[in-house]
């Protein structure tokens, strides 16, 4: 689709005569009829296949034609066409005299023709005007012409339709040849594909508008090049999405089990020594004078039972003081004024004289201690039970009552959930913090590998010599159906060639 444009510039008819030679009265009021048609080697009358146009009266005798309009007409004249421009044409321009105001052909006398020119040739689509001048015996016509494409049509013959757009169906303007020129930020055949943020990962990122980088599931970061670790992963990283590879010192499915609590948290106070003792667990060894899980509390000086021989300890602002029982004296009631004659040993203790009877020593029965056997042995004072176990005095010995999940003399052993072999069919058991997990062998599934999943025993093609293989689903074994001439569990022996047995 395009327009053939004809710009009339000057018409010369100095004598003011018609084609017949007869003069116009009072002068030749001139208008033009234009016929555009397909190329003809000899331009002949007939239908104006490409279109016609007429002008109003443009002047009398000789005149120059102004650009744009004159008397309501248009200059250049427009001859639109709705087909591919063929590149060739024929053009007939007739100058007519209008005695009156009616310019219709049927209203004019046949001899009102002033002049007629006919040209034909090649014409490429373009913006440049071709200037031409045609002269007859009495008249001269100067004009120029060109073919341009209609809006949204492009190419050498105005056959390429291209309409700029900026919507869901495309984001482009049109080049002179009708090819699309994408707007900034868009690409693709129809400029529908946004150009993502520079560096946006090709596989893990995408965009719906230019300079955007939206991440696909499992990826994050400005350029979608960082994987998202497993939900709940605390001290771990990933190289592919949903992984949780633990940092050093951390363990467990979510890397939330502290294997190096001492380093990560420094829980022990007052110069105590910290020892890691399992997942999220530690032990503080207190310096003398401190107590508590983290050695965070000072011991009162009386807590170390400094008073001997049944002396009672009293805390004071500046230390402690021992109140000694009768027969004893000294800072810690360590000196005796008694002898064995005073029967100083309690609870069945036996007395032994020392230093020629100036002193004595008590030998205590089991369960009693102290210089006078006055103290019942509390075998739980050292708090020997680990993992929150309760220490119980049982006569001459002690025992630990363990919390659920622990065992051993001192509750030092974690009861393994795997100890009772819960995984069926040879499954491998793994102890987890909150239970266990079974890794099942091929052919089994379920939390405890209790579900048999059938194996295709024929998958490994065990039968030879084109034998047909059948799977026995009840035993997960195979059976080979041998072709004629072969025997054996796998049809591996030809008939007549018995296998060589070693006996």
């Amino acid at each position: 689709s395009g327009v053939f444009q004809l710009q009339l510039q000057e018409f010369i008819n100095e004598r003011g005569v018609l084609a017949s030679g007869r003069p116009c009265e009072p002068g030749c009021r001139t208008f033009f009829r234009v016929c555009l048609k397909h190329f003809q080697a000899v331009v002949s009358p007939g239908p104006c296949t490409f279109g016609t146009v007429s002008t109003p009266v443009l002047g009398t005798n000789s005149f120059a034609v102004r650009d744009d309009s004159s008397g309501g007409g248009r200059n250049p004249l427009q001859l639109p066409f709705n087909f591919t421009w063929p590149g060739t044409f024929s053009l007939i321009i007739e100058a007519w005299h209008a005695p009156g105001d009616d310019l219709r052909p049927e209203a004019l006398p046949p001899d009102a023709l002033i002049s007629k020119i006919a040209i034909q040739g090649s014409l490429a689509v373009g913006q440049n005007w071709l200037l031409d001048e045609q002269t007859s015996t009495l008249t001269r016509l100067r004009y120029s012409y060109r073919v341009i494409c209609s809006d949204n049509y492009y190419g050498d013959n105005c056959s390429r339709l291209c309409k700029k757009r900026n919507d869901h169906f495309g984001h482009y303007v049109c080049q002179p040849d009708g090819n699309l020129s994408c707007l900034p930020g868009w690409t693709g055949e129809y400029c529908q594909q946004p150009i993502c943020l520079s560096g946006c990962h090709e596989q893990n990122g995408y965009c719906s508008k230019p300079a955007e980088c939206l991440c696909r599931p499992g990826w994050q970061g400005r350029l979608c090049n960082e994987c998202i670790p497993h939900n709940g992963c605390r001290h771990g990283t990933c190289s592919t999405p949903w992984q949780c590879t633990c940092d050093e010192g951390w363990g467990g499915l979510f890397c939330d089990q502290d294997l190096n609590y001492c380093t990560h948290h420094s829980p022990c106070k007052n110069g105590a020594t910290c020892s890691n003792s399992g997942q999220r667990s530690y032990t503080c060894t207190c310096r003398p004078g401190y107590t508590g899980v983290d050695c965070e509390l000072e011991l009162s000086e009386c807590d170390s039972n400094p008073c001997r021989n049944g002396g009672s300890c009293k805390d004071q602002e500046d230390g402690y003081h021992c109140l000694c029982p009768p027969g004893y004296y000294g800072l810690h009631c360590e000196h005796s004024t008694l002898s064995c004659a005073d029967s100083p040993c309690f609870n069945g203790g036996s007395c032994r004289e020392r230093n020629q009877g100036a002193n004595y020593a008590c030998e205590c029965p089991p369960n009693f201690t102290g210089s006078n056997c006055e103290k019942k042995v509390d075998r739980c004072t050292s708090n020997p039970c680990a993992n929150g176990g309760q220490c119980l005095n049982r006569g001459p010995s002690r025992m630990c009552r363990c919390r659920p999940g622990f065992t051993g003399t001192y509750c030092e052993l974690h009861v393994s959930d795997c100890a009772r072999n819960p995984c069926a069919h040879g499954g491998t058991c793994h102890d987890l913090e909150n239970g266990l997990m079974c890794t099942c062998p091929a052919g089994f599934s379920g939390r405890r590998c209790e579900v048999r999943t059938s194996i295709d025993a024929c998958a490994s093609s065990p039968c030879f010599n084109r034998a047909t293989c059948y799977t026995d689903l009840s035993t997960d074994t195979f059976v080979c159906n041998c072709p004629y001439g072969f025997v054996g569990s796998r049809c591996e022996f030809p008939v007549g060639l018995p296998p060589s047995f070693p006996w």
């Epitope: 948290h265 509390l297 000072e298 805390d315 004071q316 929150g388």
Partner: antibody
Framework: QITLKESGPGLVKPSQTLSLTCAVS??????????WSWIRQHPGKGLEWIGY???????YYNPSLKSRVIILVDTSKTQFSLKLSSVNAADTAVYYC???????????WGQGTMVTVSS | ETTLTQSPGTLSLFPGERATLSCRAS???????LAWYQQKPGQAPRLLIY???SRATGIPDRFSGSGSVTDSTLTISSLEPEDFAVYYC?????????FGQGTKLEIK
């Protein structure tokens, strides 16, 4: 916002074991830096510290009650519990659970639960 | 154990007056490990001061604490009606952790 709430029977018979639970809601329970304590208050009297437990399960008890006390932690349910054995009338009190961060200044307390020891 | 003795046992004052509550330890305790609590009838204690002089979150600045290794003081600069309650001191320097017997602050 962390809250603590004690629960358990309000009446226990002498010589039996008193059992209370403290439910912790909020996000600090799994932190290793807190001491989770039990404290009691005899009617019309002052406060007595019973003992504490850490998230790791390690405990420390008041020496005067040590032989009768067990404190346990259940991290999966974010709660800790008190068991006091061989109770007598002197164990009648309001029992509080409390949190202490780093040191033993108790910044968050439960509302308390009254336990009466009586036959 | 470390015994904390609070004085006076009861303190009667008018709103607007200054209150000074004392706490004495039977043996030296680090002043960094002393706390004060307020308790109203039927309620749990509320932490006011820790580390001898640091105010807990949300505690008005009329409450202040000071002290040495055996003597600590809680001061309420100008009493408000809601300040009348029982106040306890606590030491957490030595084992076992202990509390004072309390000072009852009542409206005169």
């Amino acid at each position: 916002q962390i809250t603590l709430k004690e629960s358990g029977p309000g009446l226990v018979k002498p010589s039996q074991t008193l059992s209370l639970t403290c439910a912790v809601s909020g996000d600090s329970f799994s932190s290793g830096n807190y001491y989770w304590s039990w404290i009691r208050q005899h009617p019309g009297k002052g406060l007595e510290w019973i003992g504490y437990i850490k998230y790791t399960g390690s405990t420390y008890y008041n020496p005067s009650l040590k032989s009768r006390v067990i404190i346990l932690v259940d991290t999966s349910k974010t709660q800790f519990s008190l068991k006091l054995s061989s109770v007598n009338a002197a164990d009648t009190a309001v029992y509080y659970c409390a949190r202490a961060p780093g040191t033993h200044a108790f910044d968050v307390w439960g509302q308390g639960t009254m336990v009466t020891v009586s036959s | 154990e470390t015994t904390l003795t609070q004085s006076p046992g009861t303190l009667s004052l008018f709103p607007g007056e200054r209150a000074t509550l004392s706490c004495r330890a039977s043996q030296s305790v680090s002043s960094s490990y002393l706390a004060w609590y307020q308790q109203k009838p039927g309620q749990a204690p509320r932490l006011l001061i820790y580390g001898a002089s640091s105010r807990a979150t949300g505690i008005p600045d009329r409450f202040s604490g000071s002290g040495s290794v055996t003597d600590s003081t809680l001061t309420i600069s100008s009493l408000e009606p809601e300040d009348f309650a029982v106040y306890y001191c606590q030491q957490y320097s030595r084992s076992p952790i202990t509390f004072g017997q309390g000072t009852k602050l009542e409206i005169k």
